[in-house]
């Protein structure tokens, strides 16, 4: 049962990290114009990593797309990219994982398969995650820099009492899903890796036991511990010998503990 | 036709307060910033403040701030503009003007304005 | 506060002549994020309320006559009436739309020489 639960909240987790990511990738605040030094302006900037957008006063919102590719800064395309590997990768191992759920039977399918692809999509979730908080970090970074760059030479001088002020940007809405995304993910992909530790077969090898019974003989040879979807009983992985029975739930199965930041 | 129709001019004394009105209609009161502007005779214009009567959210000018309020009755698509404490350097025309939605914060219809005078 | 400071203080063009008003901001109105200034230009008759000509420092308003044109960047801005026509005769003000509180020039008034 803790196996059960640890998989199928794992999946629940990572499919939650992975629209957080796919929401943080699309979203326009990656950027957002620092008002702490001109809070009276009427016109607002945020920038994301497909577009830049302006709000005015008048709650009109006007965005233009970066349509160039050659033109845009190194950091911002890697930042895209690490982003869109770990939606694929996210999408890949949701995709793994829902054949892998203990819950859902599809066919003959061996028990030690179901463990193989739960791990394999844990390994994935927990890339994906890894390139999202990655992504998110890097982009993070940039801008600080960029902030403490703008700060250093904040207004230029034009000539009298002339000014230009630089416009700053700082923290958006779309990090925060991003970071908080991509934990999630992170945190799913480990609970399915924990998840195929118990979901693997135990190679418990019994000594056949002779029954010598009158007229004829007949020996009970006991097949490995193999686990069910959960449906019914599986004929084929019946267990004849039982040696102290235990629960396909109880192999393994560790208690987890998580600290959410 | 979008139409801004001011209330009627006003004569006050030193230290009284006045409340003028501005009638909107033509268009979705609520969906359009409304400001005031005021202007003294014979001088230039001074903006007071504006309020978005979607969701009664208000800024207004330093200079004016605590004896300026700003409100609006949605069912009437009225906004109004109080000014308190009033002395004679009040004395000025003073519009509502609609804030253009596309047009770079640039307000695109006034109303016909109202007088007011402080006098002793 | 942005000041915006306007000249000519007063101006007499002959009717068909090209007449110019300057506007001069404080601060930058150019907006980085979209490019564009936020700078309207305004005209007043006695006795009437402010309307709108130009916006976004070059945008003409809908039902300007076209001899109206609006120039400019980042704190240096024109007005330029291509050919004076007698209803042309008012004050016109420059505002500036990037920053609160609004802030207006003192005004320029054309008259006819």
């Known amino acids: 049962m803790a196996v059960t639960a640890c998989q199928g909240l794992g999946f629940v987790v990572s499919l939650i990290g992975i629209a957080g990511i796919i929401a943080a990738t699309c979203m326009d605040q990656w950027s957002t114009q620092d008002l702490y030094n001109n809070p009276v302006t009427a016109v607002f900037n945020y920038q994301g990593l497909w577009r830049s957008c302006v709000r005015e006063s008048s709650g009109f919102t006007e965005c233009r797309g970066y349509f160039t590719l050659l033109g845009l800064p190194a950091m911002l395309q890697a930042v895209r990219a690490l982003m869109i590997v770990g939606i694929v990768l996210g999408a890949i191992g949701l995709l793994v994982s829902i054949f892998a759920l203990k819950c859902i039977r599809i066919g003959s399918m061996e028990d030690s398969a179901k463990a193989n692809m739960t791990l394999t999509s844990g390994i994935m979730f927990i890339v994906s995650g890894l390139c999202a908080i990655a992504g998110v970090s890097v982009f993070a970074n940039m801008l600080v820099t960029n902030f403490w760059m703008s700060t250093a030479n904040m207004y230029t001088g034009m000539g009298g009492m002339v000014q230009t002020v630089q416009t700053r940007y700082t923290f958006g809405a779309a990090l925060f899903v991003g970071w908080v995304a991509g934990g999630l993910t992170l945190i799913g992909g480990v609970m399915m890796c924990i998840a195929c530790r118990g979901l693997a077969p135990e190679e418990t090898n019994y000594k056949a036991v002779s029954y010598h019974a009158s007229g004829h003989s007949v020996a009970y040879k006991p097949g490995g511990f193999k686990a069910s979807t959960g449906f019914g009983s599986n004929t084929k992985n019946k267990k004849i010998y039982d040696g102290g029975a235990r629960t396909e739930d109880e192999v393994q199965s560790y208690p987890s503990k998580h600290d959410y930041v | 036709e979008v139409q801004l129709v001011q209330s009627g001019a006003e004569v006050k004394k030193p230290g009284a307060s006045v409340k003028v009105s501005c009638k909107a209609s033509g268009y979705t009161f609520t969906s359009y910033i409304m400001h005031w502007v005021r202007q003294a005779p014979g001088q230039g214009l001074e903006w007071i403040g504006y309020?978005?009567?979607?969701?009664?959210?208000?800024k207004y000018n330093e200079k004016f701030k605590g004896r300026v309020t700003l409100t609006r009755d949605k069912s009437t698509s009225t906004v109004y503009m109080e000014l308190s404490s009033l002395r004679s350097e009040d004395t000025a025309v003073y519009y509502c003007a609609r804030l253009g939605f596309t047009t770079r914060n640039a307000m695109d219809y006034w109303g016909q304005g109202t007088l007011v005078t402080v006098s002793s | 506060d942005i000041v915006m400071t306007q000249s000519p203080d007063s101006l007499a063009v002959s009717l068909g002549e090209r007449a110019t008003i300057n506007c001069k901001s404080s601060?930058?109105?150019?907006?980085?994020?979209?490019?564009?200034?936020?700078l309207a230009w305004y005209q007043q008759k006695p006795g009437q309320p402010p309307k709108l000509l130009i916006y976004?420092?070059?945008t003409r308003e809908s039902g300007v006559p076209d001899r109206f044109t609006g120039s400019g960047s980042g704190t240096d801005f024109t007005l330029t009436i291509s050919s004076l026509q007698a209803e042309d005769v008012a004050v016109y003000y420059c505002?500036?739309?990037?920053?609160?509180?609004?802030?207006f020039g003192q005004g320029t008034k054309l008259e006819i020489k």
């Open positions: 309020i978005n009567p979607y969701n009664d959210g208000t």
């Open positions: 601060q930058s109105l150019l907006n980085s994020g979209n490019q564009k200034n936020y």
């Open positions: 976004g420092a070059s």
């Open positions: 505002q500036n739309d990037h920053s609160y509180p609004f802030t």
